[in-house]
């Protein structure tokens, strides 16, 4: 549109003036006036602002509390917040990753479909026919039943989703 119908993209309106916003990593010290420019100052150590802004205070970097199982995945800068993740064997309870919980294990009869990461829990799946899991584990997939035939053996006891088949020698005595 012409002429402009608002201040420009990186400006804000104050006292009839379109003043420049402060760029990411800087906070507002004073608004522009007829006589002066917008005054901005860089955020201090352990502070950040991630957008063009008119904030008078920078935000504190997130603290990755080890007591909650957290550790730093990416150190914050003046323009970005710190990114936390969880210690090995743990995962975040939310997208914001404010605390961690132990990865769940898949019970006997269930295998791991997807191994947990720092931000997602273990995904389990029931062992289908022909597969079993006899342990509680956060890593083990369902294992296929042993094939007795390939060992020249016969099934003595059928497998379940929690147990393998039991193979035995073929009965040579025929009536």
């Amino acid at each position: 549109p012409e002429p402009p119908t608002a201040c420009r993209e990186k400006q804000y309106l104050i006292n009839s003036q379109c003043c420049s916003l402060c760029q990411p990593g800087q906070k507002l010290v004073s608004d522009c006036t007829e006589f002066t420019e917008t005054e901005c100052l860089p955020c201090g150590e352990s502070e950040f602002l991630d957008t063009w802004n008119r904030e008078t205070h920078c935000h504190q970097h997130k603290y990755c509390d080890p007591n909650l199982g957290l550790r730093v995945q990416q150190k914050g800068t003046s323009e970005t917040d710190t990114i936390c993740t969880c210690e090995e064997g743990w995962h975040c309870t939310s997208e914001a990753c404010e605390s961690c919980v132990l990865h769940r294990s898949c019970s006997p009869g269930f295998g791991v479909k997807q191994i947990a990461t720092g931000v997602s829990d273990t995904i389990c799946e029931p062992c289908p026919v022909g597969f079993f899991s006899n342990v509680s584990s956060a890593f083990e997939k369902c294992h296929p039943w042993t094939s007795c035939e390939t060992k020249d053996l016969v099934v003595q006891q059928a497998g379940t989703n929690k147990t393998d088949v039991v193979c035995g020698p073929q009965d040579r005595l025929r009536a």
Epitope: P3, P4, R8, C18, E37
Partner: antibody
Framework: QVQLVQSGAEVKKPGASVKVSCKAS????????MYWVRQAPGQGLEWMGW????????TYAQKFQGRVTMTRDTSISTAYMELSRLRSDDTAVYYC??????????????????WGQGTLVTVSS | DIQLTQSPSFLSASVGDRVTITCRAS??????LAWYQQKPGKAPKLLIY???TLQSGVPSRFSGSGSGTEFTLTISSLQPEDFATYYC?????????FGQGTKVEIK
């Protein structure tokens, strides 16, 4: 204090191109649109277009479409105006100017509050 | 394009004189008009924007008025440093055109 410092005078042959720079200081470069205006010897002022230094998007006066390219480098707070296929009637002083916007009576009023010192471009064979 | 016609093109005046320059637009531009002063070899300097608002640092002897198609720049008491060329500019419609200029000379 706000300053717009332009590159030095240029002498070019017809058909050549010229690139003029405009280095800004004393304010947040990406916060204000930058305009280019030229003035032929002894003549009036002619508006060429503008660039949004934040996005890099330019708008050109129809007269210069296809011959002018306005760019910027935010890392060094510098705007550029390149004019190609130069003719003798492109001989002029080229100015960069910063846009200011004033709000009053429900309207937004632009004007050019700071200007570069000008760059003389002479096109001669 | 919107044409701006300044009158007069030349003006001879003495220090202390009241000077008025007119700028006429070929179509209505509301108050989207600015006035600039330019001295030889120098860049233009903003005097007035929004037709009548004085730019900071500009002496109060300069004033602007008008709306629509007719605008005036007035210097209430001409000073030696005011001898220069004055341009109006419309900012209502692209391209943002300038008037041809009014040169104020010493009588």
């Amino acid at each position: 204090q706000v300053q717009l410092v332009q590159s030095g005078a240029e002498v070019k042959k017809p058909g050549a191109s010229v690139k003029v720079s405009c280095k800004a200081s004393g304010y947040t470069f990406a916060g204000y649109y930058m305009y280019w205006v030229r003035q032929a010897p002894g003549q009036g002022l002619e508006w060429m277009g503008w660039i949004n230094p934040d996005s890099g998007a330019p708008t050109y006066a129809q007269k210069f479409q296809g011959r002018v390219t306005m760019t910027r480098d935010t890392s060094i707070s510098t705007a550029y105006m390149e004019l190609s296929r130069l003719r003798s009637d492109d001989t002029a002083v080229y100015y960069c100017a910063r846009e200011k916007i004033y709000y009053g009576s429900g309207n937004y009023y632009p004007s050019f509050d700071y200007w570069g010192q000008g760059t003389l471009v002479t096109v001669s064979s | 394009d919107i044409q701006l016609t300044q009158s007069p093109s030349f003006l001879s005046a003495s220090v202390g004189d009241r000077v008025t320059i007119t700028c006429r637009a070929s179509q209505g531009i509301s108050s989207y008009l600015a006035w600039y002063q330019q001295k030889p070899g120098k860049a233009p300097k903003l005097l007035i924007y929004a037709a009548s608002t004085l730019q900071s640092g500009v002496p109060s002897r300069f004033s602007g008025s008008g709306s629509g198609t007719e605008f005036t720049l007035t210097i209430s008491s001409l000073q030696p440093e005011d001898f220069a060329t004055y341009y109006c500019q419309q900012l209502a419609s692209y391209p943002w055109t300038f008037g041809q200029g009014t040169k104020v000379e010493i009588k």
